[in-house]
Interface confidence: low
């Protein structure tokens, strides 16, 4: 429904607080280097303008699109050319090209300092001194570091962040109360950001059809009692929400997400029996809860799939009449029966079914041609099952840190051209699949593991896209969204790689390593491991293990020494020499 003033419409729907927060997120996600104060000023100006439009929708400029209003505002930033270089050229374009230009300049790995957590008392003082500024700063810092963060979900995180400080800053032991909550928010936030990044990549790189297929499969697993029409409606609405958020239309996205939550709760009887608790919560909690809700129980006595999709004489007729609807029904029926499969596996099965029908419905005897299509599914199902079984066994044998190291070696050998920080980050995240998923029973392992790996490999893909260095990564990332993981799994050692020159400086360590947290110390060691493999890609597991064990012993020894720095200097030289000898460098 058309509104005379879009900005007034969204301001009234969302309320001032959410309106301001979402505009701040949008601006910070576009201009990631701009100082906080500059963004706050821009947001305040937009908000004051929106209020004039609420008062009189016919007022000057109130009829302009949000992209026009926001783009014009961003293009008033004086330092645009110095800070952002060619992004300033976006301002010479007209909408919608200008917004597309801003979107293309979003940086998944912005050159921003690491967020350092101040002392608890310092944070509580800042919170009490100016709660509004403190919370805005949180939104700003997360949004600029995660330019695709799902904006309405960031409002939910901010609400929890505020609640944590409200409660804990008056607790007897502020740190014991606050720190675990902040840890939890940080970990959940990173996971949320990565999941949303995959949704946006799916829409932007593979199109709406790919995203809708993903959504049909996932929602059918989650709501197996809902009818196909109901699932289709939810998929359509959900696609609109994510298209808007991924496109920078955050006000529309948040508004439509709220409408979708309202719809789901008003129709829960025909969707899922698991929604009752979610639907009793306030809006932000409700939307989050629905997005995370457990799978409903499968209806009893579901008939065999073969009757409608293999044995029926009308298969080709039904397919020809409405290909995407028929394939959507196939995906829905398969997914609701298989909560034990990953979404990407379900999509591979649907693709195989589609390819078979394309070929067979043009054949002399279509039924004879597609009669054995379900037999083609067996190897596709067994491949991830076997991979997960092997890797969970390895994880249980090694523990998380050493499992990460095994993956570091594996992936560095596959794609040694990728930067060391990216290899460390991605392999560490890949390694977390063990503690995240291997504890689950068989029926939950595959959806947990393979869909999580899709999220992590997408991080590799978006980081690599910024600075492409490996044709193999580009190939696995761009050929097929659902086959990314099998593509990377199938990569062997890159025989074309010319080993990196040995540089002793890379393996020089100082006493500062002793004061690092366990996690940061692990990252240092894992960085060294990647560099070792880049120098000696043909090194055996045993050789690398020996060097890494020596390295761990060296760090432990020198961190206990009275004169740590001297120890690191002298023992470090010996270690480098011994490692070179052990690896034949």
């Amino acid at each position: 429904d058309a509104h005379k003033s879009e900005v007034a419409h969204r301001f009234k729907d969302l309320g001032e607080e959410n309106f301001k927060a979402l505009v701040l997120i949008a601006f910070a996600q576009y201009l990631q280097q701009c100082p906080f104060e500059d963004h706050v000023k821009l947001v305040n100006e937009v908000t004051e303008f929106a209020k004039t439009c609420v008062a009189d929708e016919s007022a000057e400029n109130c009829d302009k699109s949000l992209h026009t209003l926001f783009g014009d505002k961003l293009c008033t930033v004086a330092t645009l050319r110095e800070t952002y270089g060619e992004m300033a050229d976006c301002c010479a374009k007209q909408e919608p090209e200008r917004n597309e230009c801003f979107l293309q300049h979003k940086d998944d790995n912005p050159n921003l300092p690491r967020l350092v957590r101040p002392e608890v008392d310092v944070m509580c003082t800042a919170f009490h001194d100016n709660e509004e500024t403190f919370l805005k700063k949180y939104l700003y810092e997360i949004a600029r570091r995660h330019p695709y963060f799902y904006a309405p979900e960031l409002l939910f995180f901010a609400k929890r962040y505020k609640a944590a400080f409200t409660e804990c800053c008056q607790a007897a032991d502020k740190a014991a109360c606050l720190l675990p909550k902040l840890d939890e928010l940080r970990d959940e936030g990173k996971a949320s950001s990565a999941k949303q990044r995959l949704k946006c990549a799916s829409l932007q790189k593979f199109g709406e059809r790919a995203f809708k297929a993903w959504a049909v499969a996932r929602l059918s697993q989650r709501f197996p009692k809902a009818e196909f029409a109901e699932v289709s409606k939810l998929v359509t609405d959900l696609t609109k929400v994510h298209t808007e958020c991924c496109h920078g239309d955050l006000l529309e996205c948040a508004d439509d997400r709220a409408d979708l939550a309202k719809y789901i709760c008003e129709n829960q009887d025909s969707i899922s029996s698991k929604l009752k608790e979610c639907c009793e919560k306030p809006l932000l909690e409700k939307s989050h809860c629905i997005a995370e809700v457990e799978n409903d129980e499968m209806p009893a006595d579901l008939p065999s799939l073969a009757a409608d999709f293999v044995e029926s004489k009308d298969v080709c007729k039904n397919y020809a009449e409405a290909k995407d609807v028929f394939l959507g029904m196939f995906l829905y029926e398969y997914a609701r029966r298989h909560p034990d499969y990953s979404v990407v596996l379900l999509l591979r099965l649907a693709k195989t079914y589609e390819t078979t029908l394309e070929k067979c419905c043009a054949a002399a005897d279509p039924h004879e041609c597609y009669a054995k299509v379900f037999d083609e599914f067996k190897p596709l199902v067994e491949e991830p099952q076997n991979l997960i079984k092997q890797n969970c066994e390895l994880f249980e044998q090694l523990g998380e840190y050493k499992f990460q190291n095994a993956l570091l070696v594996r992936y560095t050998k596959k794609v040694p051209q990728v930067s060391t920080p990216t290899l460390v980050e991605v392999s560490r995240n890949l390694g977390k699949v063990g503690s995240k998923c291997c504890k689950h029973p068989e029926a939950k392992r595959m959806p947990c593991a393979e869909d999580y790996l899709s999220v992590v490999l997408n991080q590799l893909c978006v980081l690599h896209e910024k600075t492409p260095v490996s044709d193999r990564v580009t190939k696995c990332c761009t050929e097929s969204l659902v086959n990314r993981r099998p593509c990377f799994s199938a990569l062997e050692v890159d025989e074309t790689y010319v080993p990196k020159e040995f540089n002793a400086e890379t393996f020089t360590f100082h006493a500062d390593i002793c004061t690092l947290s366990e996690k940061e110390r692990q990252i240092k060691k894992q960085t060294a491991l990647v560099e070792l493999v880049k120098h000696k890609p043909k090194a055996t597991k045993e050789q690398l293990k020996a060097v890494m064990d020596d390295f761990a012993a060296f760090v432990e020894k020198c961190c206990k020494a009275d004169d740590k720095e001297t120890c690191f200097a002298e023992e470090g030289k010996k270690l480098v020499a011994a490692s070179q000898a052990a690896l034949g460098l």
Epitope: A163, E167, H288, K439
Partner: nanobody, 119 residues
Framework: EVQLLESGGGLVQPGGSLRLSCAAS????????MLWVRQAPGKGLEWVSV????????YYADSVKGRFTISRDNSKNTLYLQMNSLRAEDTALYYC????????????WGQGTLVTVQS
């Protein structure tokens, strides 16, 4: 139905040790951060210690740092609190609770186990 059942409390002399246990059921223990809280006679609730679902990180109130150790066994759905060098001021009713993940309230508490430190 969520249940948290504490045990291991008792009477102990100053300088002594006790190990509290908390058996959990009715929720996915291995994805929940957990904590110990205590209430001394006539006083308000006081944080004791928090443990992340994976076992690390852990956090302690200043008053128990270096003396108490929180741990968990996810395979047994059990939370522990090892209390050493006990003092008279540690006398309290000790509760285990499920750490909130979304709502900022403690949804679930146990009934508590009483620890009395006196000579």
């Amino acid at each position: 139905e969520v249940q948290l059942l504490e045990s291991g409390g008792g009477l102990v002399q100053p300088g002594g040790s006790l190990r509290l246990s908390c058996a959990a059921s009715g929720f996915t223990f291995d994805t929940s951060s957990m904590l110990w809280v205590r209430q001394a006679p006539g006083k308000g609730l006081e944080w004791v210690s928090v443990i992340h679902q994976s076992g690390t990180p852990t956090y302690y109130a200043d008053s128990v740092k270096g003396r108490f150790t929180i741990s968990r066994d996810n395979s047994k759905n059990t939370l522990y609190l090892q209390m050493n060098s006990l003092r008279a001021e540690d006398t309290a009713l000790y509760y285990c609770a499920k750490f909130p993940s979304s709502r900022m309230k403690f949804d679930y508490w146990g009934q508590g186990t009483l620890v009395t430190v006196q000579s």
